[in-house]
């Protein structure tokens, strides 16, 4: 058995359903996406040995599903997937990779062919611990590269300052596939948000530890860089689920309540 979870049940139905649903979010001139053709292009990877799928195997899929990303709306992330999805709010606030068509259809899904057979493996799929060229990692590498290339204006990045190995994973999708593919001439600046989990450990903040590595890397590449600790709009969203925690005390709101009383 592989280390990863097996192919998601009803993969095709979920994929096609998400694709059809997403088309409604696209501008009229971009709405002519053929979801069946996109699925067929995606399915090419499902016909290959589960340890022999390359990022380039998804080229046709990307070309068919690609669309523009609004300027200033790109949101990159590491170790904050759910928070990013919630905050982006189905493209309303931002458009992270999971909110572009080619990311949406695969978000939180798993897929692979059986090792010695043509059917899908619903029991387990390889992770990077099993082999580098597995279907899911190769997909996200290719998708990440495209997302970076198509991003413009102010680039936003949400990182997790409570992550034990550091807010900026030196070995991660953002470091290895996204930063190298940012198009300098299209980007005005990069804004980092270092978020800390409510009640979680304070591992790093702006200008500390691995964040110094990230800052140096981006500045060396010629990008304008800024960093915000616990960006307030995101913090408020985190506090929805932790309203009584001391980190979520709204001093101005408390004062207003007292005045009323």
């Amino acid at each position: 058995r592989w280390r990863g979870e097996g192919t998601s049940a009803h993969l095709r139905d979920i994929f096609l359903g998400r694709c059809a649903e997403y088309r409604a979010l696209l501008s009229p001139e971009q709405r002519n996406k053929n979801c069946t053709a996109i699925w067929e292009a995606f399915k090419v990877a499902l016909d290959k040995d589960p340890c022999s799928v390359l990022p380039s195997d998804y080229d046709l899929f990307i070309n068919l599903s690609r669309h523009s990303i609004p300027r200033d709306k790109s949101l990159f992330w590491e170790n904050s997937h759910l928070l990013v999805n919630s905050f982006a709010d189905n493209t309303r606030r931002f458009m992270p990779l999971s909110d572009v068509l080619y990311g949406r259809v695969a978000d939180f899904l798993s897929w692979c062919r059986q090792k010695n057979d043509s059917g899908l493996d619903y029991q387990s799929c390889p992770t990077s611990e099993d082999c580098e060229n597995n279907p899911v990692d190769s997909f996200w590498k290719r998708a990440s590269i495209q997302y970076s290339k198509d991003s413009s204006g102010v680039i936003h990045v949400m990182l997790n300052g409570s992550e034990p190995t550091g807010a900026y994973p030196i070995k991660g999708f953002f470091a290895d596939y996204e930063i190298p593919n940012l198009q300098k001439e299209k980007i005005t600046r990069i804004e980092i948000w270092v978020m800390h989990e409510i009640g979680g450990p304070n591992v790093e903040s702006c200008g500390e530890g691995s964040m110094k590595v990230l800052e140096k890397r981006l500045k060396d590449m010629g990008f304008q860089y800024s960093c915000i600790n616990d960006y307030r709009p995101v913090k408020l969203l985190q506090c929805v689920d932790h309203s009584t925690h001391p980190d979520c005390a709204l001093k101005s709101a408390a004062a207003a309540t007292q005045r009323k009383a």
Partner: antibody, heavy 117, light 109 residues
Framework: QVQLKESGPGLVQPSQTLSLTCTVS????????VSWVRQPPGKGLEWMGI???????AYNSLLKSRLSISRDTSKSQVFLKMNSLQTEDTATYYC???????????WGQGVMVTVSS | QFVLTQPNSVSTNLGSTVKLSCKRS????????VNWYQQHEGRSPTTMIY?????PDGVPDRFSGSIDRSSNSALLTISNVQTEDEADYFC????????FGGGTKLTVL
Amino acid sequence: QVQLKESGPGLVQPSQTLSLTCTVSGFSLTSYHVSWVRQPPGKGLEWMGIIWTGGSTAYNSLLKSRLSISRDTSKSQVFLKMNSLQTEDTATYYCARSITPTFFDYWGQGVMVTVSS
Amino acid sequence: QFVLTQPNSVSTNLGSTVKLSCKRSTGNFGNNYVNWYQQHEGRSPTTMIYRDDKRPDGVPDRFSGSIDRSSNSALLTISNVQTEDEADYFCQSYSSGIVFGGGTKLTVL
């Protein structure tokens, strides 16, 4: 230049508590993480725990129950406290600096601690 | 938590090339970098290689790091071995915490 220097008692009685200090210079404890690593005589290195730039800590699960790491940023000092010492805790204790929590770029000279009655 | 296994000792001739291995027990090094430290007798460790293959300033270019995926091992290669290279070498990686290999004693003949 970057320096880390460990200090503390060379001899500790069994069942007693070990207190060590790591005094750093050439960098800020709010910019770099500091770990404690120990090495029994003639043996390999064992990571004990870390104090992150944010002030939170993490510990080796085998030592967690009797280990505590803290710091005083104004004095540029990191402290290690370990209770219930046994003879197998005899080792050279190092503090080490990290810019990311996953590797060390500078090490202290080490302090030899013997646990014996 | 995985284990990093290194040979206890390796002997090599002056001026030759030697490869020190560090084998990971489970999984691979795909998600985690490997770092190498040199420790001379009675001294504290110093970083020789970090993030798989990067050399800190001051470390001779005779030292290089790599990952051999076929054997799931990290390799520290020392070319043109000198007498001052005689030391203990420790590999290190991480998952939920820092993990060290047991170390290899390099003897230069």
